[in-house]
């Protein structure tokens, strides 16, 4: 059986590790190209060298391969607050991250935005800010947590969930008012 030419994984499995099956001759296994290089020409025959060329500037391959083109280097997204941690090399893509005291929020698997870590004003740090998670705050009495910020209970409306957290505070205020009238 001749493997499907479109099914790269099945074709590779016919050859030993580190080799791939010649696209025009399934009796020949060619050596894969090292990371940092790409396939320029398939090996002409068994035991003969594959013609691999180094990736050009702005492109890379991070593992052994038989790609016809190197992959384009990623660019860090300024509009998302990203900064370059390490620049692209022929065998490694750009590494993007966030500044100090910021964390990554992933909107999707391959898209993140940098946000400032919460300072927990009017509260205490329950869990410190991590690379991919904001600080977790615990609020002082008289404050409730809203979108990871400690907000005064005076901003708590009856319809909001904060009523449970602010209830003792509200009752205290009522109690003070009642005792003042006698």
């Amino acid at each position: 059986l001749v493997p499907h030419l479109g099914d790269r994984e099945k074709r590779d499995s016919v050859c030993p590790q580190g080799k791939y099956i010649h696209p025009q001759n399934n009796s020949i296994c060619c050596t894969k190209c090292h990371k940092g290089t790409y396939l320029y020409n398939d090996c002409p025959g068994p035991g003969q060298d594959t013609d691999c060329r180094e990736c050009e500037s702005g492109s890379f391959t991070a593992s052994e391969n038989h790609l016809r083109h190197c992959l384009s280097c990623s660019k860090c997204r300024k509009e998302m607050g990203q900064v370059e941690i390490s620049s692209c090399t022929v065998d490694r893509d750009t590494v993007c991250g966030c500044r100090k005291n910021q964390y990554r929020h992933y909107w999707s698997e391959n898209l993140f935005q940098c946000f400032n870590c919460s300072l927990c004003l009017n509260g205490t740090v329950h869990l410190s800010c991590q690379e991919k998670q904001n600080t977790v705050c615990t609020c002082h009495a008289g404050f409730f947590l809203r979108e990871n910020e400690c907000v005064s209970c005076s901003n708590c409306k009856k319809s909001l969930e904060c009523t449970k957290l602010c209830l003792p505070q509200i009752e205290n205020v009522k109690g003070t008012e009642d005792s003042g009238t006698t």
Partner: nanobody, 119 residues
Framework: EVQLLESGGGLVQPGGSLRLSCAAS????????MVWIRQAPGKGLEWVSH????????YYADSVKGRFTISRDNSKNTLYLQMNSLRAEDTAVYYC????????????WGQGTLVTVSS
Amino acid sequence: EVQLLESGGGLVQPGGSLRLSCAASGFTFAHEPMVWIRQAPGKGLEWVSHIDRVGQDTYYADSVKGRFTISRDNSKNTLYLQMNSLRAEDTAVYYCAILPKRGPRFDYWGQGTLVTVSS
């Protein structure tokens, strides 16, 4: 008051095209990166595409790459999404939004426009 008003949705056959618009007011449009997000029936919000302030840098979700094009006209305070080669799985309510700055939540987004892809 910030206002974002989407339009251009409708019923379209698979393989068809639509162009969504988002008219912005109440803020300096040219100063804000903008986002298109969508919500398919019974699903969560999905980031579709975004564009920087000047329209130079763009991003597309893998599911729409090569089919959708985001653009903006700062002189008209309008954001666009050109949708080609539409598929049934593109059926959703599409929202435009200002890229969040303070935290991972959308403080400003529109009421949405429904796109239905069906034969």
